[in-house]
């Protein structure tokens, strides 16, 4: 006799055996595309992906025969649960193909997108290394603005229609899988059902994120105020002492990690530099050395070496002009014991820590390789992200850097070096939390249908100002898709994992430091060489997804839930110091200020009162005409008054704060140069000169088309009748 459970086991054994092979073929084809973006490799990836999808769909269909309520064995139950999830395979064939095409196209646009110099179209930059270099190192406000705006204009705008379609198809897929929407589907990764005392709902994740964010806010607000004061020194007259931070000044293309602001914000600059980039360069480190050092760290806590195949097959440097690759760092578990990292490593401290992060993924992958195919994953997505981060917390400590020769042997730790270190850590770790929370909150709202697509950008920047305290340096209308200018958005990765991982990593760090018998503050703990800490971690890693994450967390840290306390404890000395630094500064931000506010002109339009029943609707076409009319006025003014032929176009007239009762602000930039804002006084003169032409275009007059602060016209306000 054979029970249903035994039959399910037989079914799953057969599945595991066949899945291994097909998944490997698909992964390999995907790796080939990611390391060498060609049309042929896209085709191969799609073909292998189609085979894998078809197999998965068939197996998922067969798995429905096994009722979960009759399965007692948790391992069998979890595998069936995973397999009964249909994922994208619930879509019709044509929709499934379309979704695949959209995802591939978005990925290709992102990784091959170029920005060219308007004065020399042959001179072009990719994101990596070109634009990222500017955003990491440049202190030129206008150069940064050019890179920031060009990336979003070139790449974001191309992604916009694709992203709109992606949202519709992913929602359809999620609903067919019995989720409310795609955001809900993503949150399903944290769901735990039917395990007494360890259950966790998708709604609970939202609650936990919201209430932990409230607890983090005071620390972030003080970091924000301190950074703002330092940016005011670096960019005099560009920053408001009570306003948001301009989005293009924050250390990378997205303001995601503020790490590169360290040199501008270092509290005690006379102390030896704990950003060891220069030491790495001086000592001739290369990508191989960086990863070998990361490996040494893992091995020192008793975790395994990387495989021979890892070193042979990984792509650890940018292939440059040889071929185009996806340069965003990723860790790959292709199956069959084949583990790889793809990263365009640069010799910087930042990439030294990123190497630990990526190798953390591989350690997790290797640890659960013995689990059945369907349970080879992190207990939840945040766990996977946390592993390498735990190692980075130790690897970044002055103690550890000293031990590997990147800080001088006579480096002395004191209160000042401690604050320098904690500030550097906070720029990376605390600075990113509101960014992460706000991005995912926006996507959740989009998937839920709470933000109509004609308000995506409007809401994005409203939320960015309110939650993150960051403002757009130039306004963006609904032709842009700023979220998709980030890898994770255009490449279909959930993002809340980077929030949850940050909380978990400090919970884990606290527990592992106890295991390593560390004494003293948490921020000084370096777990390297502690096999006790390594063993404690490994016991969790090897479980993969075979146990609920709430249970796995409890096994390591003694609590079932994410908790922000350890993170706040870690940064406590810095928080105290920041409060003292900020005692004469405004902490928080006004969302009203923008970098372009001073040069903006407000317009009010009264169609109803001017035209009565003949009033037309103010829409995108009318706005296009308005911007064209102002561009015309600018051309006329520069030609007639300044004897300069400057070809202003409608795209140089930048509109913000459009209100439905028709008011908005606008300012004008020089053609092909977003950072060259034409002074408001010049624009006012141009408007006055062409006022009647602009009025006529809209069948309005000086009162119903009102430019606030501009005298109606150069002529008398009321023409006497001609006799």
């Amino acid at each position: 006799q054979s029970t249903i459970e035994e039959q399910a086991k037989t079914f799953l054994d057969k599945f595991n055996h066949e899945a291994e092979d097909l998944f490997y073929q698909s992964s390999l084809a995907s790796w080939n595309y990611n390391t060498n973006i060609t049309e042929e490799n896209v085709q191969n990836m799609n073909n292998a992906g189609d085979k894998w999808s078809a197999f998965l769909k068939e197996q998922s269909t067969l798995a429905q025969m096994y009722p979960l309520q009759e399965i007692q064995n948790l391992t069998v139950k979890l595998q069936l649960q995973a397999l009964q999830q249909n994922g994208s395979s619930v879509l019709s064939e044509d929709k499934s193909k379309r979704l695949n095409t959209i995802l591939n196209t978005m990925s290709t646009i992102y990784s091959t997108g170029k920005v060219c110099n308007p004065d020399n179209p042959q001179e072009c930059l990719l994101l990596e290394p070109g634009l990222n270099e500017i955003m990491a190192n440049s202190l030129d406000y206008n150069e940064r603005l050019w890179a920031w705006e060009s990336w979003r204009s070139e790449v974001g705008k191309q992604l916009r229609p694709l992203y709109e379609e992606y949202v519709v198809l992913k929602n359809e897929m999620a609903r067919a899988n019995h989720y409310e929407d795609y955001g809900d589907y993503w949150r399903g990764d944290y769901e735990v059902n039917g395990v007494d005392g360890y259950d966790y709902s998708r709604g609970q994740l939202i609650e936990d994120v919201e209430h932990t964010f409230e607890e983090i806010k005071p620390l972030y607000e003080h970091l924000h105020a301190y950074v703002r004061a330092k940016l005011m020194n670096a960019y005099p007259s560009y920053i408001s002492p009570i306003g948001c931070l301009p989005a293009h000044l924050l250390g990378d293309m997205w303001g995601r990690f503020w790490t590169n602001l360290y040199s501008l914000t270092v509290p005690f600059g006379q102390k030896p530099n704990i950003d060891v980039t220069d030491a790495m360069v001086d000592q001739a480190w290369d990508a191989q050395r960086i990863f070998k050092e990361a490996e040494k760290f893992f091995v020192s806590v008793g975790l395994p070496n990387m495989t021979q195949g890892f070193w042979e097959n990984s792509m650890l440097t940018d292939p440059g002009n040889v071929q185009k690759a996806v340069c965003h760092p990723t860790a790959w578990d292709l199956g069959k014991g084949d583990f790889r990292i793809l990263m365009c490593t640069k010799v910087t401290m930042d990439d030294f820590l990123t190497a630990h992060h990526e190798m953390g993924h591989i350690q997790y992958d290797m640890a659960y390789a013995a689990q059945p195919f369907l349970l080879r994953n992190g207990a939840n997505e945040g766990f996977h992200e946390a592993v390498g981060e735990i190692m980075s917390l130790s690897a970044a400590t002055p103690k550890h850097l000293k031990s590997i020769g990147l800080l001088s042997p006579d480096f002395q730790e004191d209160n000042e070096t401690e604050i320098n270190f904690l500030l550097k850590q906070a720029l990376t770790i605390v600075g990113t939390l509101p960014f992460t929370y706000m991005l995912e909150k926006w996507r959740w709202m989009v998937f839920k249908g709470e933000i109509p697509k004609d308000q995506w950008m409007k809401k994005w920047w409203e939320m960015k100002r309110e939650i993150v305290g960051v403002v757009e340096p130039v306004p963006h209308d609904e032709t842009y898709c700023d979220p998709a200018s980030l890898f994770h958005v255009s490449n279909d990765y959930s993002f809340i994992r980077y929030y949850t991982r940050t909380l978990y990593q400090f919970q884990f760090q606290e527990a592992l430091c106890q295991a390593a018998k560390h004494e003293g503050p948490l921020h000084k703990c370096d777990i390297s060489n502690s096999t006790e800490a390594g063993q404690k971690l490994f016991n969790m890693l090897r479980l993969g997804k075979s146990e609920p994450w709430t249970l796995a967390l409890e096994n390591v840290v003694g609590a079932k839930n994410m908790n922000v306390r350890p993170l706040l404890n870690y940064f406590e000395p810095l928080f105290t110091w920041l409060k003292d630094q900020n005692k004469n500064s405004f902490v928080g931000w006004s969302t009203d200020w923008s970098p372009y506010a001073d040069q903006s002109i407000k317009v009010r339009i009264s169609l109803k009162s001017a035209l009565g029943d003949k009033a037309y609707e103010w829409n995108d076409n009318e706005m296009y005409l308005f911007r064209s009319s102002v561009a015309y006025a600018m051309r006329q003014y520069f030609l007639k008054v300044k004897n300069q032929m400057i070809l202003f176009g409608e795209e140089d007239v930048r509109v913000a704060n459009l209100k439905p009762r028709i008011s908005f602000n606008f300012f004008v930039t020089a053609p092909k140069n977003v950072s060259d804002i034409i002074p408001r006084t010049e624009v006012e003169k141009a408007i006055r000169m062409s006022r009647s032409r602009i009025n006529d275009a809209f069948r309005l007059n000086d009162n119903s088309l009102e430019f606030l602060g501009i005298q109606p016209t150069l002529g008398p306000p009321n023409q006497p009748p001609v006799s």
Partner: nanobody, 116 residues
Amino acid sequence: EVQLVESGGGLVQPGGSLRLSCAASGRTFSDARMGWFRQAPGKEREFVGAVSWSGGTTVYADSVKGRFTISADNSKNTAYLQMNSLKPEDTAVYYCATTEDPYPRWGQGTLVTVSS
């Protein structure tokens, strides 16, 4: 090994009923489950429902809940799919499979056409 033969298909008007049978020979497990699947023209094969020879839990796809009923007659080694309130979108080739054979070799199936 188990051999399965489906029968009972045909043309039926919307709102009508039909009963399909799946005869199993070579059965060895009293505790196995019988599943019904269907494949509409140009679509992927989809799960309809499943029942255990020994009773137990019966599961259905959302699209057929409340209209279709699956049963099994242990003594006759036959499983049934009673389909009521049929709709044009139920038009498909219907197949049966068993958990005794984790990787079914799909038979000919039986064609059900719902049309006025």
